[in-house]
Interface confidence: low
């Protein structure tokens, strides 16, 4: 150990000597001589054991995306972005970190999952937990009262990923929100329409969107005899009904949260109900619930919402579910969550939910929290749970053993004989300049078989083959990789032919 320390000291001193000589602009020979001594000492030292102990890995709760995973991700994003744009949304971006004060007090119990940063500048900073609070801050800061925007970015949560499978500490959110004072339920209905469009387009299986209203929940708790201080904690118990039985939820409310059994039973009568607009009508006639101002407002809005959802042709995908009690503190009105449905084991059984893939709701008070005068900007929005969707799409493609292309290369520029590198370089450059996605192998004289194999592995559909004879005739041999069919194409027509075959528009518009 002492021997190693002595050697380390010698290496350090010799290193300083080399640096000194370089600064003094000493002769190259002298520097070389001293560098050789330094290398010799380093060789004697051998590998640093402490460095060997270092385990190369990504931080807990994060992961790398391979080209294959990125290809899946880009396809998913493309579907989502096209839908957001189809509905007239603008796009914004905000910093990955916010002032800590911006995020505090917005997430209830989830605040403990916020990542704090250390900043030499003296500002207390935190990584964003979601995209909604930064959006509200953006609106308040820019005094905006009206915007329809989407935002796709990474968010950060100090979740314990080991405990919750499929959950990460860094993950993407895809949010769409409408801010502004509009007539009731029209923007809310559009958000639900967008959710359904995206989930249908992604073809990840049958889904159901559960809808409720924070005001109905609060009114229901009030008439059942839950004290104000227990609303939020009872909410979190009720929200577990999609995962556990009513008995377990009741035990938690009574045993752990100190609710009287008869109060829990009254809640149970409501929260176990779900249905469509007929359930809304039924509850509007409920002698107790209809007497509660908040609940009445919520039910009235839901009735209107269902009318619009019918006009949008998605009412069959929506279920009014009184047990939906989404966790975030900032929701004030309609709340919704989309779940994928498993095929029931036997006919006649109810479809089983297998987890949330999108969610959202109305949050009319959030912007007001940032405004010095408390001015409110009503907002409604949705968030697509893309991480979950990525893994579902990946699994589906693996099950189908479908090859996913990780590049978009349309053509490989190849040669059949030696000494044609210059011609290949000229041709690939012509193709790039014309907007064709093209590649070539980085070898002077690659074998034609190797070039064709590369195309098969990478999924490149076409090969443009240059040969001595072709050069004389002014043509290029264009070969389809899958059908192996070859045609001679005049060099000046090559770009057009590749575009025609790969379905690319003929002009780069």
């Amino acid at each position: 150990m002492a021997e190693r320390a002595a050697l380390e000291e010698l290496v350090k001193l010799q290193g300083e000597r080399v640096r000194g000589l370089k600064q003094q602009k000493a002769s190259a020979e002298l520097i070389e001589e001293e560098v050789a001594k330094l290398l010799k000492l380093k060789a004697q030292l051998g590998p640093d054991e402490s460095k060997q102990k270092f385990v190369l890995k990504t931080p807990k709760g994060t992961r790398d995306y391979s080209p294959r995973q990125m290809a899946v991700r880009e396809k998913v994003f493309d579907v989502i972005i096209r839908c957001f744009k189809r509905h007239g949304a603008e796009v914004i971006d905000t910093p990955v970190f916010e002032l800590k004060e911006t995020l505090m007090g917005k997430y209830g119990e989830d605040s403990k999952l916020i990542y704090d940063l250390k900043d030499q500048g003296g500002e207390l900073l935190s990584l964003r937990y979601d995209l909604t609070v930064p959006f509200a801050r953006y609106l308040a800061m820019n005094k905006l009262t009206n915007i329809k925007r989407y935002h796709i970015a990474k968010v950060y949560r100090r979740d314990n990923p080991a405990m919750t499978r499929g959950r990460y500490r860094e993950f993407y959110q895809c949010d769409f929100d409408i801010a502004g004072n509009f007539d009731p339920m029209i923007p809310d209905a559009e958000c639900l329409k967008i959710m359904c469009e995206i989930l249908s387009s992604l073809q990840i299986g049958d889904f159901l969107v559960k809808v409720n209203d924070r005001r109905i929940l609060d009114g229901m708790f009030a008439i059942c005899g839950v004290s104000d201080s227990k609303f939020r904690t009872i909410c979190s118990s009720v929200d577990k009904l999609d995962k556990v039985s009513w008995e377990e939820v009741k035990n938690e409310m009574v045993g752990e949260k100190g609710l009287a059994p008869e109060v829990a039973d009254r809640i149970g009568d409501y929260v176990q109900q779900h249905g469509g607009v007929s359930l809304v009508e039924q509850l509007l006639q409920d002698p107790k619930l209809s007497q509660n101002k908040q609940a009445l407002e919520g039910l009235g809005d839901l009735k209107l919402l269902f009318e619009y959802l019918t006009l949008f042709g998605i009412d069959d995908k929506i279920s009014f579910d009184l047990s939906l009690a989404r966790g975030l503190d900032y929701y004030t009105g309609v709340i919704y969550e989309a779940v994928l449905l498993q095929t029931p084991a036997q006919a006649g059984e109810e479809p089983l939910g297998v987890g949330s893939v999108a969610a959202g709701g109305r949050y009319d008070g959030l912007v007001g929290m940032f405004d010095p005068k408390g001015r409110k900007v009503p907002c409604v929005g949705l968030s697509i749970g893309v991480e979950r969707i990525f893994s579902i799409v990946e699994q589906r493609l693996e099950a189908l053993e479908e090859k996913i292309r990780t590049t978009e290369t349309q053509v490989l520029v190849a040669s059949a004989q030696k000494k044609l590198l210059e011609e290949r370089l000229k041709l690939v450059s012509e193709l790039w300049d014309a907007g064709i996605k093209a590649e070539l192998l980085y070898k002077k004289n690659p074998k034609l078989l190797n070039q064709l194999q590369y195309c098969e592995e990478a999924g490149i559909p076409l090969v443009a083959i240059i040969g001595e004879q072709e050069l004389k005739d002014g043509v290029i041999k264009l070969r389809s990789v899958t059908s192996r069919e070859e045609v001679d194409v005049r060099r000046e027509d090559l770009v057009e032919e590749i575009k025609r075959r790969t379905g690319q528009p003929l002009c780069i518009c």
Epitope: K100, M104, G105, K106, Y107, G108, E109, S111, K112, Y115, D116, L117, K118, Q120, L124, R158, D329
Partner: antibody, heavy 122, light 110 residues
Framework: QVQLVQSGAEVKKPGASVKVSCKAS????????IGWIRQAPGQGLEWMGD????????NDNEKFKDRATMTADTSTSTAYMELSSLRSEDTAVYYC???????????????WGQGTSVTVSS | DIVMTQSPDSLAVSLGERATINCQSQ?????????MHWYQQKPGQPPKLLIK???NLESGVPDRFSGSGSGTDFTLTISSLQAEDVATYYC?????????FGGGTKLEIK
């Protein structure tokens, strides 16, 4: 197991400096911050600041900013706190403690050194 | 700096009885604030972490200790006092630099 072992008691004259060491073992030294807390005789606890050996970043209590210097030597897994211009009211037991979290500004201190008694007297 | 006001300064409780210590933090506006920690210190020993983030029991700490509260008011409760619980108890916040501690509550057996 995690251990923080501090240097021995010191007696100093007013105006002098004292350097207290805290040797850590049983965990990866660069992953956690080390805080310094002092306790005057019969008094409560006072946080002086902390250092995060991973990036040598320090948080300082303004009260001690000009007099307390926190450093860390990653090769020996040892943190140091030097307090200069000592006065009689600096007589206290000085503790080092590990920040319970690796992440920024939310530290509870989960492991403590045994304390180093510093007496300032002419 | 955030001032932490601990009460009472001292407390005498019979063995097996409940002991409650309060801590109030000033100048923290948000109700979701829970960056409050509790320590136990016995004479001649360094402090020992009992509760972190208002209510999370540190591993190895007996479950007769519990913490509650959010916003500005926090409580440490010992449900059934044992002889080995005689000590001084401190609260500490980690909301902003500098961390500050409460003045301490000396707990004795009645």
């Amino acid at each position: 197991q995690v251990q923080l072992v501090q240097s021995g008691a010191e007696v100093k004259k007013p105006g002098a400096s004292v350097k207290v060491s805290c040797k850590a073992s049983g965990y990866t030294f660069t992953d956690y911050c080390i805080g310094w807390i002092r306790q005057a005789p019969g008094q409560g606890l006072e946080w002086m600041g902390d250092i995060c050996p991973g990036d040598a970043y320090t948080n300082d209590n303004e009260k001690f900013k000009d007099r307390a210097t926190m450093t860390a030597d990653t090769s020996t897994s040892t943190a140091y706190m030097e307090l200069s211009s000592l006065r009689s009211e600096d007589t206290a037991v000085y503790y080092c403690a590990r920040g319970e979290e690796q992440l920024g500004l939310r530290n509870a201190m989960d492991y403590w050194g045994q304390g180093t008694s510093v007496t300032v007297s002419s | 700096d955030i001032v932490m006001t601990q009460s009472p300064d001292s407390l005498a409780v019979s063995l097996g009885e409940r002991a409650t210590i309060n801590c109030q933090s000033q100048s923290v506006s948000t109700s979701t604030y829970n960056y409050m920690h509790w320590y136990q210190q016995k004479p001649g020993q360094p402090p020992k972490l009992l509760i972190k983030y208002a209510s999370n029991l540190e591993s190895g700490v007996p479950d007769r200790f519990s913490g509650s509260g959010s916003g500005t008011d926090f409580t440490l409760t010992i449900s059934s006092l044992q002889a080995e619980d005689v000590a001084t108890y401190y609260c500490q916040h980690s909301w902003e630099i500098p961390w500050t501690f409460g003045g301490g509550t000396k707990l004795e057996i009645k």
